[in-house]
Interface confidence: low
């Protein structure tokens, strides 16, 4: 393309560069639904923001296709290892795409944090962090799931969170 | 603004893009002060660098406002769980702003690594990683704190570190 | 340089910005060689991709000098703590440079995950995540090593992975 075209593209790129897509969503009291669905997140208050991405029912929704570094941290904690609780916690980032009914695992961690507690009444804490680069198309969604979510400990949005930015 | 203005901005953007703010600071023998203050960091030797950010008394100081991915890892370790040591380790990234006297929690993890050691003489190791996107204004500072810092194990800057880059 | 020169550079920068180097490599059955060498990775199938970086024998190879956020996660797991297995797992990112024969440690974590298992037949899981910004020259390589790699658990590329992007 000629200089004019290049110029338009450069201006466009500068404008889009100003809003390089990024988001950081924080844990809130409403995050844990107990429904088996994905975690829900705060999108506006405190440290939470959306810039060039949108949010729907726990999902970051991509508006501009590209490669994104996506990340999530969850704070886990409990007292001993109650019977009926899975000894393994699975924390994952999953993709939902309009073209396909199933969620796709993107980044996943398994941990056995309860095993740290050597007595049934001992308080324990653990943290799980995930981050990695994935390609996302416009309209695709990313969600966070934790199984068993009863061990997720929320407080103030600093201990459990979910975010992304285009790289 | 007209083409000339756009041109100037584009040139400016190219120049600033050349120094997209980034930093990686590494743990050193002087990192642990025992004073209750934030951890201190190496800024020049080895793998450490500052590019478009500055450093003061343990803090990364923002010179250009924007959204930053900030991160820190600390290497924890010990022998058994000595009495008097907290069973919970808190590792966090905190913001100091000129407009407000209190530090603000940004990203925090709690872990109970001692619980891994099944005997009082057992050596254990654990690692805590934090990372997330936050908005920072020029002049704001970010620090790392660990409570109880006596369990942080330093060696050569590869195991405990602190960094940021603009997204 | 004059406007023409600047223009050329801007056009060039726009083109290079379109392929801001990034990669995400995933764990595969062939990742664990049992050789003491670095882990090997899937570069094309599924979630894996290379964009402006290349791959050779487990290494991400830099083609464009700059600061890169490099990261890796490995999924660890086992049943109890078999004798002969190191009680400490070391997971690290290492640099190989054409100018120097020895590898340089960049980012390293030590963990004692076996200690979580309070009985010899208990299944345990743990995850180690590393990420940080390092400067890499063209031709330099980054590899992932895990000692003892017998505790790395592979499945489908979502639990153990390795990536980088220029910041």
């Amino acid at each position: 393309d000629g200089p004019a075209g290049s110029w338009e593209q450069l201006i466009q790129e500068r404008r889009s560069h100003e809003v390089n897509p990024a988001a950081h969503l924080t844990g809130a009291n409403s995050s844990l639904t107990g429904s088996g669905g994905p975690l829900l997140w705060e999108t506006q208050l405190g440290l939470a923001f959306l810039r060039g991405l949108s949010y729907h029912d726990g999902a970051l929704v991509v508006t501009k296709a590209g490669y994104y570094y996506i990340y999530s941290k969850v704070q886990l904690g409990g007292v001993g290892c109650p019977l009926g609780l899975a000894s393994t916690i699975t924390h994952g980032l999953y993709k939902r795409t309009p073209r396909y009914p199933e969620e796709l695992e993107l980044l996943v961690s398994q941990q056995s944090p309860c095993g740290r507690a050597t007595s049934s009444s001992r308080v324990w804490w653990d943290s799980s962090f995930l981050g990695g680069v994935v390609h996302l198309e416009a309209g695709e969604k990313v969600v966070v799931r934790v199984l068993d979510e009863r061990l997720v400990r929320l407080r103030d949005g600093t201990r459990s969170y979910f975010g992304a930015f285009m790289v | 603004d007209g083409p000339a203005g756009s041109w100037e901005q584009l040139i400016q953007e190219r120049r600033s893009h050349e120094v997209n703010p980034a930093a990686h600071l590494t743990g050193a023998n002087s990192s642990l002060t025992g004073s209750g203050g934030p951890l201190l960091w190496e800024t020049q030797l080895g793998l450490a660098f500052l590019r478009g950010l500055s450093y003061h008394d343990g803090a990364l100081v923002v010179t250009k406002a924007g959204y930053y991915y900030i991160y820190s890892k600390v290497q924890l370790g010990g022998v058994g769980c000595p009495l008097g040591l907290a069973s919970t380790i808190t590792h966090g990234l905190y913001k100091r702003t000129p407009r407000y006297p209190e530090e603000l929690e940004l990203l925090v993890s709690q872990q109970s690594p001692c619980g891994r050691a099944t005997s009082s003489s057992r050596v254990w190791w654990d690692s805590s990683f934090l990372g997330g996107v936050v908005h920072l204004e020029a002049g704001e500072k970010v620090v790392v704190r660990v409570l109880d810092e006596r369990l942080v194990r330093l060696r050569d800057g590869t195991r405990s570190y602190f960094g940021a880059f603009m997204v | 340089d004059g406007p023409a020169g600047s223009w050329e550079q801007l056009i060039q920068e726009r083109r290079s910005h379109e392929v801001n180097p990034a990669a995400h490599l995933t764990g595969a059955n062939s990742s664990l060689t049992g050789s003491g060498g670095p882990l090997l990775w899937e570069t094309q199938l599924g979630l894996a991709f290379l964009r402006g970086l290349s791959y050779h024998d487990g290494a991400l190879v830099v083609t464009k000098a700059g600061y890169y956020y490099i990261y890796s996660k490995v999924q660890l797991g086992g049943v109890g703590c078999p004798l002969g297995l190191a009680s400490t797992i070391t997971h690290g990112l290492y640099k190989r440079t054409p100018r120097y024969p020895e590898e340089l440690e960049l980012l390293v974590s030590q963990q004692s995950p076996c200690g979580r298992a309070t009985s010899s037949s208990r299944v345990w899981w743990d995850s180690s995540f590393l990420g940080g910004v390092v400067h890499l020259e063209a031709g330099e390589k980054v590899v992932v090593r895990v000692l003892d790699e017998r505790l790395v658990r592979l499945r489908d590329g979502t639990r153990s992975y390795f990536g980088a992007f220029m910041v």
Partner: antibody, heavy 117, light 107 residues
């Protein structure tokens, strides 16, 4: 410049132990590992094992497993190799070398250990 | 363990000769191979790593090639100071192993 300086020659009786030291200078000790290699009189080179000066992790050749212990002291930038239950065929020059995860770039001058009754 | 077989074990040559030493690995080791030179009473000295990369300070008459299971060290024009024993070493799999050595003697 990089230097590895080893302790002096030793004469030991069968069944005894020997400890050889290797003091490193001229580089950041904890960034790299130390390998130990031995060479019996008139023979080739034999790799004994490796220790990370950083993590203390070790990897010993099967042949020496249970008889050898490699350690490091990061405060003095010194690596140590202890070989126990010495036999006459352990008579050799013992070398420390910087590296082991990749190549053995710098070597100590060697320490002659003689095992004789 | 990976066995490395060097050939020949002994080699007689004259100053100015082109000398080639071969090292075979019992299984593929990609290019994880190094070559060392050792003179009597001295520690080995690194010549080449990653099969073909010349270590800093080593004369350019030394070169290495090969990948997988077969590797060669070539000295393009033998000099008086090159009379020594040469060892190959694989760096891919623990335990690290050395070839049996090739002694280059004056003819």
């Amino acid at each position: 410049q990089v230097q590895l300086v080893q302790s002096g020659a030793e004469v030991q009786k069968p069944g005894a132990s020997v400890m050889v030291s290797c003091k490193a200078s001229g580089y950041t000790f904890t960034y790299y590992g130390i390998s130990w290699v031995r060479q019996a009189p008139g023979q080739g080179l034999e790799w004994m094992g490796w220790i990370s000066a950083n993590s203390g992790n070790t990897n010993y050749a099967q042949k020496f497993q249970g008889r050898v212990t490699m350690t490091t002291d990061t405060s003095t930038n010194t690596a140590y190799m202890e070989l126990r239950s010495l036999r006459t065929d352990d008579t050799a020059v013992y070398y420390c070398a910087k590296g082991g995860v990749a190549v053995l770039e710098y070597w100590g001058q060697g320490t002659l250990v003689t095992v004789s009754s | 363990d990976i066995q490395l077989t060097q050939s020949p074990s002994f080699l007689s040559a004259s100053v100015g000769d082109r000398v080639t030493i071969t090292c075979w690995a019992s299984q593929g080791i990609s290019s994880y191979l190094a070559w060392y030179q050792q003179k009597p009473g001295k520690a080995p000295n690194l010549l080449i790593y990653v099969a073909s990369t010349l270590q800093s300070g080593v004369p350019s008459r030394f070169s290495g090639s090969g990948s997988g299971t077969e590797f060669t060290l070539t000295i393009s024009s033998l000099q008086p100071e090159d009379f020594a024993t040469y060892y190959c070493q694989q760096l891919k799999i623990y335990p690290l192993t050395f070839g049996g050595g090739t002694k280059v003697e004056i003819k």
